[in-house]
Interface confidence: medium
């Protein structure tokens, strides 16, 4: 028996359902009584789901997996994984045994889009030319870790004086905070782009800074 899976990783959004495709070619006269099907985690060998002795043995993996029972006889051994979590990411192996035996692994890549960035300015009032201003770009609840880019209002990339931190919450999703420090006087529009590298999703935020003119000497 020859087992086939998709070579490309399956990309699934957090809290959605994912199908890990696996198929085999049944011989004429094949019946489900002949089928032994096992899905397991490739690295740890933990059992995920199985079909043996002519029946679905059910989920061994947090009760969130299912087969497609009506399609098994046609050679469809795909696994449905419900309410995907970050911790589900990894490689899954599909083992099929009828008379002989074959297996193949499929990768699950979990993703979550980042929120539209919120932009904050510090200080946010009494700005004067020459002041150092800190612009913070914050985007939330994404996965995997984001790539963050800054540019000016003309699209020219800004690379100096940027600090980016990313923190995972209890669900494994990342909150990203990127800080750009600029000297006011190079004021204008500053844009932050938070990219999800798996989804190729870009979330944009921008802020326009206008400095107040100084009078010399300062008026009392």
């Amino acid at each position: 028996v020859e087992v086939q899976v998709s070579e490309d990783p399956v990309v699934a959004l957090v809290d959605t359902d994912a199908t890990l495709r696996c198929s085999f070619s049944p011989e004429p006269g094949f019946s489900l009584a002949q089928l032994n099907l096992i899905w397991q985690l490739t690295d740890t060998k933990q059992l995920v789901h199985s079909f043996t002795e002519g029946r679905d043995q059910g989920s061994a993996y947090s009760n969130r997996t299912a087969l497609f029972p009506d399609l098994l006889v046609q050679g469809n051994a795909s696994l449905r994984l419900q309410r995907v979590r970050v911790t589900d990411e990894g490689s899954y192996t599909c083992f099929v045994s009828i008379q002989d035996f074959d297996s193949a692994a499929v990768s699950l890549q979990v993703a979550a889009p980042y929120s539209k960035p919120s932009m904050t300015l510090e200080p946010n009032k009494d700005l004067r030319p020459g002041n150092m201003v800190t612009i913070t770009c914050s985007s939330y609840q994404g996965y995997p870790e984001a790539e963050v880019f800054w540019k000016d209002g003309q699209g020219v990339p800004l690379t100096g004086n940027v600090t980016t931190s990313q923190m995972a919450n209890e669900r494994g999703l990342f909150d990203v905070h990127s800080v750009l420090r600029v000297v006011l006087g190079a004021n204008g529009t500053y844009s932050c782009l938070v990219r999800n590298p798996v989804l190729q999703q870009d979330a944009h935020g921008s802020v326009t800074i206008t400095g107040q003119p100084l009078t010399f000497p300062p008026e009392a």
Partner: antibody
């Protein structure tokens, strides 16, 4: 449709100040970056500088001591001043709108030829 | 400043032919965000420069798909398939990675 139109004297004497106006229609000069680019005889193009949507400026360091870009938002115009000109400043001057995300230089004025000569 | 080099001052071409125009930069224009900040302009006789290609390979609005851009971080090519009479003019590359933006010297496309 966005349109840019340069205007100003076509002849300037050496050591004097070259002053040009760019009049913008179809867009607000508080919404993008606005640039000056010039083309010398013989086809060489030089980026001169910009004024941003908030009024800040950038000048090409090769011109920094001589150039000033200003604007008048009420007229939706921006301006170029180049001091102490020489015959080397002869060329065609273009005003150009910068683009934020989708590519640079989609909108150019038709250009104005300025000759520096005694 | 980043130096842009267009080593071929002029290219004679017969209408219907395909042509490639090259440009080099003294520094890589590939940014870590995946964009390559290289632009191509065409200046037809008596006209202002027209944007053809932005970010190395993206066709600007209204530009025929006979034009295409490609390249690496420092070596770039503008390809015109099936050259037409209206393609005559001077082609400039420009870097948009750093201020001051800088241009190549131009390559003049002439009909044979």
């Amino acid at each position: 449709e966005v349109q840019l139109q340069e205007s100003g004297p076509s002849l300037v004497k050496p050591s004097q100040t070259l002053s040009l106006t760019c009049s913008v229609t179809g867009d607000s000069i508080t919404s993008a970056y606005w640039n000056w680019i010039r083309k010398f005889p013989g086809n060489k193009l030089e980026y001169m500088g910009y004024i941003s949507n908030s009024g800040s400026t950038y000048y090409n360091p090769s011109l920094k001591s001589r150039i000033s870009i200003t604007r008048d938002t009420s007229k939706n115009q921006y301006y170029l001043q180049l001091n102490s000109v020489t015959t080397e400043d002869t060329g065609t001057y273009y005003c150009v709108r910068g683009e934020r995300y989708y590519g640079y230089g989609a909108y150019w004025g038709q250009g104005t030829l300025v000759t520096v000569s005694a | 400043d980043i130096v842009m080099t267009q080593a071929t001052p002029s290219v004679p071409v017969t209408p219907g032919e395909s042509i490639s125009i090259s440009c080099r930069s003294s520094k890589s224009l590939l940014h870590s965000n995946g964009n390559t900040y290289l632009y191509w302009f065409l200046q037809r006789p008596g006209q202002s420069p027209q944007l053809l290609i932005y970010r190395m390979s993206n066709l600007a609005s209204g530009v025929p798909d006979r034009f295409s851009g490609s390249g690496s971080g420092t070596a770039f090519t503008l390809r015109i398939s099936r050259v037409e009479a209206e393609d005559v003019g001077v082609y400039y590359c420009m870097q948009h990675l750093e201020y001051p933006f800088t241009f190549g010297a131009g390559t003049k496309l002439e009909l044979k």
